[in-house]
Interface confidence: low
């Protein structure tokens, strides 16, 4: 099959970081700088992803891959091959479309991105709170008071937590 | 319509302790958060603390801590704020207000309509 | 623990504007709230999440916030307006107030 296509189509044999030029009657061609072509039998070579801005190089164009970027520190890559650049936050924060802003009571954020999310309820599980939460950190559940029998050392939730973080009660 | 009503006006000898109520009504009472503030003749608001019900979780100025409590009865939808060791500074109007926890950020959105608290010897 | 700073006071003329400050570190971070008091009565919202406007607060009102100040701005200053303005943010699980600003309509 391979060798009937060829006989076909004289464009199969051209390699990757080459393309079929047609106009020099279809012979190989290598891609021209700043282009490349990750498959054989192109027509055509694309042109290399420029990581300008806020991105940043990860990986350099070459004949037959595309350049990779991330993004310069302070920012978070997002979408298919870091097709956008997000502000990082700090832990217990959230981006917001005023910028980054804290993450308010009840809830906790422990990375750079992403949305603050609500403490766990442990009392949906039948348990209490061991550890309180903190913007930064979500809370601690442990065993229900009923699962500490009596005699048993019993577990005493620490007094609410007061570091600095985001609180609206 | 939601409604937070607080008990009435407080007169208390200094030393003593006051209990203060605020009943919700017209919202789901354990999905929010109940904050207590106070305001001095004259003066600005003062945030004391506050309680999610959901949690049971509640927290202080550092100000009242260890002299304010802050509870709430989720069954009755009421919080409750308990001040001891009261001196005649601790004359205020005193208001829970809701903080709405299901949107972000937090605001007080609804307040009761305060609670006058004298000490006086 | 975090600080609000607010000017004590201020006086407009009808029809002016007015600007309520609000100082504190790296403000920008937080969200602020503004709430309108008058004599007798208990506060209320008038500006949320820095510069949301909750229904029934007129145009004429806007907040913003950025570096270490947040802004409350009342264009067309009526009589009406008259009344003490605080600022609130939460830092931490504390909730902090500004000092409260007394706006006088001349």
């Known amino acids: 099959f391979e060798r009937t296509r060829s006989l076909q189509d004289p464009c199969s044999n051209c390699p990757a970081g080459t393309f079929c030029d047609n106009n020099r009657n279809q012979i190989c061609s290598p891609c021209p700088p700043n282009s490349f072509s990750s498959a054989g039998g192109q027509r055509t070579c694309d042109i290399c992803r420029q990581c300008k801005g806020v991105f940043r190089t990860r990986k350099e164009c070459s004949s037959t891959s595309n350049a990779e970027c991330d993004c310069t520190p302070g920012f978070h890559c997002l979408g298919a091959g870091c097709s956008m650049c997000e502000q990082d936050c700090k832990q217990g924060q959230e981006l917001t479309k005023k910028g980054c802003k804290d993450c308010c009571f009840g809830t906790f954020n422990d990375q750079k991105r992403g949305i603050c999310r609500p403490w766990t309820n442990c009392s949906l599980d039948g348990k209490s709170v061991l550890v309180n939460g903190t913007k930064e950190r979500d809370v601690v559940c442990g065993p229900s008071p009923a699962d500490l029998s009596p005699g048993a050392s019993s577990v005493t939730p620490p007094a609410p937590a007061r570091e600095p973080g985001h609180s609206p009660q | 319509q939601v409604q937070l009503v607080q008990s009435g006006a407080e007169v208390k000898k200094p030393g003593s302790s006051v209990k203060v109520s605020c009943k919700a009504s017209?919202?789901?009472?354990?999905?929010?958060?109940i904050s207590w503030v106070r305001q001095a003749p004259g003066q600005g608001l003062e945030w004391m603390g506050g309680i999610i019900p959901i949690f049971g979780t509640a927290n202080y100025a550092q100000k009242f801590q260890g002299r304010v409590t802050i509870t709430a009865d989720e069954s009755t939808s009421t919080a409750y704020m308990e001040l001891s060791s009261l001196r005649s500074e601790d004359t205020a109007v005193y208001y829970c207000a809701r903080v709405g926890r299901l949107e972000r950020p937090y605001y007080f959105d609804y307040w009761g309509q305060g609670t006058l608290v004298t000490v006086s010897s | 623990s975090y600080e609000l700073t607010q000017p004590p006071s201020l006086s407009v003329a009808p029809g002016k504007t007015a600007r309520i400050t609000c100082g504190g570190d790296n403000i920008r971070s937080k969200s602020v709230n503004w709430y309108q008091q008058k004599p007798g009565q208990a506060p209320l919202l008038v500006i949320s999440?820095?510069?949301d406007r909750p229904s029934g607060i007129p145009e004429r009102v806007s907040g913003s916030n950025s570096g270490n100040t947040a802004t409350l701005t009342i264009s067309t200053v009526e009589a009406g307006d008259e009344a003490d303005y605080y600022c609130q943010v939460w830092d931490g699980y504390v909730g902090v107030f500004g000092g409260g600003t007394q706006l006088t309509v001349l």
């Open positions: 999440f820095d510069s």
């Open positions: 017209g919202g789901t009472f354990s999905s929010y958060a």
